[in-house]
């Protein structure tokens, strides 16, 4: 096994955006320790929420990696409202190979939430020569960047879409685009396609904007 | 200084897409060596193009990093056509802390180039209530992902734009969006805005699509 005189490293990951926005899902903060040696394989975790120690984390069995070190993961389930209200989550990792415990802290991006504006854009006239066309959903002006986007038609999910990662805009908010690809015939028949967005700053955390060939829709 | 028994690491970076597509620019392959120790600071580079050693690389003075290690960079200028034709560039790094030299190889993404389709999309009617509006350029169907996008108006560059990274589409090609933000008044006055795209599969490696309020443009 390689000697790792630098000792283990610790990485702390936030919950998935969708998990924090939906009550029936389970948001988790994940503390990952890598480069744990065979000589000192024992890792101890302590978790704190706003500085107060909590004891409901679950530590998974350590996993051996290809480079003959271990990876150890501890997962803390968080309360939706605690995360959205900006509470701080600290993971404190102790291991004999470390001169002192490593502490990592994470919380929701600070700053005033801003509501996304959602705009749907029909295909370019030039694309109408193709068999398939692109329907576009521009989601802009939102903060923080945690967001979820999907498409529907006639109340049923549309699956052939692709969404860009949120990008930082010049005003400090975020934007993204989502592209739904549909057969031109479906578009020309006047079917209605809807772009759905979930974000914490939206009323009811949800909005939907529709798009169809017939004008005014 | 920390002991780094793993020794240095080597990273090889491709040229910027725009540099490979414009004859007036200088495409460079960059070889970066990190975690070079004070004990063994000397780094030797050898460069190969399609297996043949070349001697025109420039090695920069080593730079001390915050963690008391050195970072050393060597830059090889490449011929535009060599890169676009898929030649392989190898950087071979020797250092006393390494049991054997480290070799890294890079070349243009393999596969048949595919020409981007470029579509400009005007602002949504709903956005016209705002002081600024979003002009969208959808670039899709291209391969490989190396591409450059910019905006201009009346032959002058427009700077308030933001371009998403290329995203892999369902057919194996790439797409991206670029969003230009302009004052609504400029849009309503009928100014013409153009999205310029550079990609190796385009005729003359360049195309431009325009967008304005007046119909048919």
């Amino acid at each position: 096994a390689p000697e790792l005189l630098g000792g283990p490293s610790v990485f702390l990951f936030p919950p998935k955006p969708k998990d924090t926005l939906m009550i029936s899902r389970t948001p988790e903060v994940t503390c990952v320790v890598v480069d744990v040696s065979h000589e000192d394989p024992e890792v101890q975790f302590k978790w704190y929420v706003d500085g107060v120690e909590v004891h409901n984390a679950k530590t998974k069995p350590r996993e051996e990696q290809y480079n003959s070190t271990f990876r150890v993961v501890s997962v803390l389930t968080v309360l939706h409202q605690d995360w959205l209200n900006g509470k701080e989550y600290k993971c404190k990792v102790s291991n004999k190979a470390l001169p002192a415990p490593i502490e990592k802290t994470i919380s929701k991006t600070k700053g005033q939430p801003r509501e996304p504006q959602v705009y749907t854009l029909p295909p370019s006239r030039e694309e109408m020569t193709k068999n398939q066309v692109s329907l576009t959903c521009l989601v802009k002006g939102f903060y923080p960047s945690d967001i979820a986007v999907e498409w529907e038609s006639s109340g049923q999910p549309e699956n052939n879409y692709n969404t860009t990662p949120p990008m930082l805009d010049s005003d400090g908010s975020f934007f993204l685009y989502s592209k739904l690809t549909v057969d031109k015939s479906r578009w020309q028949q006047g079917n209605i396609f809807s772009c759905s967005v979930m974000h914490e700053a939206l009323h009811n955390r949800f909005t939907q904007k529709s798009l169809s060939l017939s004008p005014g829709k | 200084a920390p002991e780094l028994l793993g020794g240095p690491s080597v990273f090889l970076f491709p040229p910027k897409p725009k540099d490979t597509l414009m004859i007036s620019r200088t495409p460079e392959v960059t070889c970066v060596v990190v975690d070079v120790s004070h004990e063994d600071p000397e780094v030797q580079f050898k460069w190969y193009v399609d297996g043949v050693e070349v001697h025109n690389a420039k090695t920069k003075p080593r730079e001390e990093q915050y963690n008391s290690t050195f970072r050393v960079v060597s830059v090889l200028t490449v011929l535009h056509q060599d890169w676009l034709n898929g030649k392989e560039y190898k950087c071979k790094v020797s250092n006393k802390a390494l049991p054997a030299p480290i070799e890294k190889t890079i070349s243009k993404t393999k596969g048949q180039p595919r020409e981007p389709q470029v579509y400009t999309l005007p602002p949504s009617r709903e956005e016209m209530t705002k002081n600024q509006v979003s002009l969208t350029c959808l670039v899709k169907g291209f391969y490989p992902s190396d591409i450059a996008v910019e905006w201009e108006s009346s032959g002058q560059p427009e700077n308030n734009y933001n371009t998403t990274p290329p995203m892999l589409d369902s057919d194996g090609s790439f797409f991206l969006y670029s969003k230009l933000t302009v004052d609504k008044s400029r849009w309503q006055q009928g100014n013409i805005f153009s999205c310029s795209v550079m990609h190796e599969a385009l005729h003359n490696r360049f195309t431009q699509k325009s967008l304005s309020l007046s119909p048919g443009k």
Partner: nanobody, 121 residues
Framework: QVQLQESGGGLVQAGDSLRISCRAS????????MGWFRQAPGKEREFVGR??????????YYVDSVKGRFTISRDSAKNTVYLQMNSLKLEDTAVYLC????????????WGQGTQVTVSS
């Protein structure tokens, strides 16, 4: 354990009204798209309509054949979704199934067993 349990079906006269319910356990109806489907004997399962996630009805969708007659609503406190059916027609006879879909999911994730609605003349 996620469960959707329909109830309230029965035999009614054409032109009458009926409200059927779908009680959820193991999930929260406000978090999901909650939909109603129906399956008449010897026919394919047919989508009826759905409400979107969040405590609102702004984006509720109905198929044309039930628009104006059927209404989907939700009671978050009871974690229950309802289908109010008015002006029932003979062709509304079917087993009515409740379904839930997570945001971003490509298909309906959770299904109930169904409740029989029979409309007679």
């Amino acid at each position: 354990q996620v469960q959707l349990q329909e109830s309230g079906g029965g035999l009614v006269q054409a032109g009458d009204s009926l409200r059927i319910s779908c009680r959820a356990s193991g999930l929260t109806v406000n978090d999901l798209y909650m939909g109603w489907f129906r399956q008449a004997p010897g026919k394919e399962r047919e989508f009826v309509g759905r409400v979107t996630p969040g405590d609102n009805t702004d984006y509720t969708y109905y198929v044309d054949s039930v628009k104006g007659r059927f209404t989907i609503s939700r009671d978050s406190a009871k974690n229950t979704v309802y289908l109010q059916m008015n002006s029932l027609k003979l062709e509304d006879t079917a087993v009515y199934l409740c379904a839930g879909r997570r945001f971003g999911s490509s298909e309906w994730d959770y299904w109930g067993q169904g409740t029989q609605v029979t409309v007679s003349s």
